[in-house]
């Protein structure tokens, strides 16, 4: 029950996170005009990954897309790439995790396969979240650098008579949305990985052999990482030899600690 809850919650958290990453990527407020030195402007500038906008006090807003690809800063291109990679990985992760959900029955899919898919989606969510956090952080760093550079030469003019106030940009709402969304996706991914451990059978999917020493009833069982199952076919009930060695499938009939959660 707890495994299903963990998996379900991980899925929902990741879903919210990826929706947030998509929203942040599409938002225009990645950087907004800093009004600290100029709160009396009637024209407010803000910029996104794809276009820059100007909002006038009258309510009129005009946005212009970045129609050039080669003329854009390399950092902006890198941020775009990171966000898109994050979205793509997250979307694939969501697709995989839907089929991996314990509450959804698809044919005769085994728990081992579901565990694998849960782990795969979890890793995808983690990478997706990291991509989003990295993208937003790179952009934020770029803003901080530009902010202090423009502050250094804020007032440039003819003999101090004319002031040309350089427009400075500060963090926009999209950055905070991106950070939170990336974090949620990351948390969701971790939860999926935790759920995967509970979904996996007690033993690993390769043929675990227990050796019975004469006169002893203690069996040695190799207990590798339970999630290291493959998508490959599992030959059922195939005995290796009769003298005390059993296949994993026979051992599975013993109660597992996860059966009573």
């Amino acid at each position: 029950m707890a495994v299903t809850a963990c998996q379900g919650l991980g899925f929902v958290v990741s879903l919210i996170g990826i929706a947030g990453i998509i929203a942040a990527t599409c938002m225009d407020q990645w950087s907004t005009q800093d009004l600290y030195n100029n709160p009396v402007t009637a024209v407010f500038n803000y910029q996104g990954l794809w276009r820059s906008c100007v909002r006038e006090s009258s309510g009129f807003t005009e946005c212009r897309g970045y129609f050039t690809l080669l003329g854009l800063p390399a950092m902006l291109q890198a941020v775009r790439a990171l966000m898109i990679v994050g979205i793509v990985l997250g979307a694939i992760g969501l697709l995989v995790s839907i089929f991996a959900l314990k509450c959804i029955r698809i044919g005769s899919m085994e728990d081992s396969a579901k565990a694998n898919m849960t782990l795969t989606s979890g890793i995808m969510f983690i990478v997706s979240g990291l991509c989003a956090i990295a993208g937003v952080s790179v952009f934020a760093n770029m803003l901080v650098t530009n902010f202090w550079m423009s502050t250094a030469n804020m007032y440039t003019g003819m003999g101090g008579m004319v002031q040309t106030v350089q427009t400075r940009y500060t963090f926009g709402a999209a950055l905070f949305v991106g950070w939170v969304a990336g974090g949620l996706t990351l948390i969701g991914g971790v939860m999926m990985c935790i759920a995967c451990r509970g979904l996996a059978p007690e033993e690993t999917n390769y043929k675990a052999v227990s050796y019975h020493a004469s006169g002893h009833s203690v069996a040695y069982k190799p207990g590798g990482f339970k999630a290291s199952t493959g998508f490959g076919s599992n030959t059922k009930n195939k005995k290796i030899y009769d003298g005390g060695a059993r296949t994993e499938d026979e051992v599975q009939s013993y109660p597992s600690k996860h059966d009573y959660v």
Partner: antibody
Amino acid sequence: QVQLKESGPGLVAPSQSLSITCTVSGFSLTSYGVYWVRQSPGKGLEWLGVVWAGGNTNYNSALMSRLSISKDNSKSQVFLKMNSLQTDDTAMYYCARDRGRLLAMDYWGQGTSVTVSS
Amino acid sequence: DVVMTQSPSSLSVSAGEKVTMSCKSSQSLLNSGNQKNYLAWYQQKPGQPPKLLIYGASTRESGVPDRFTGSGSGTDFTLTISSVQAEDLAVYYCQNDHFFPFTFGSGTKLEIK
């Protein structure tokens, strides 16, 4: 067609308050901002303030403490209220419509003359 | 506040002549976001309210004769009347539309000889 018409008291005693109404037609106050501008006799134009389509306002910092601009969208009226009038507040008071883009005043009222005298 | 300085304060020309008047602002009126200058020119004839001629420093308002041209960027702006007509007798004001308060210049009075 777009029209703006100011109506005021004409004569105001010093230290008293001034109330002017600008009645508009041909456009909606929910879509356009309205400015107030005054012109002292033989002098230039002085921007007083604005009420935007959304209802938010901006004022001339020199007059902010005694100036108030409001509106009634349903009645298509904009109101200017100024307190503690002095003789140098004697002027022609105009209301004007914001053109929407690039913030300029495209339509003006004929103005109302206000004299501050005892 | 942004100070708008107009020059000359008055000028007298004959009909058909070309006229240029200047307007300087204490702060740049060019917005980096859309590369637009937030400056307007108004014409005020005696006994009348002002009339919008130019907005965005160079865009002519509809119905304004094409002999009126606005130019300039940043802090220096110019209004040019290519061939002055008798009806152009008026005071011309420039206005900052970028920073509150939206200050006006002191005006340039155009007289016809």
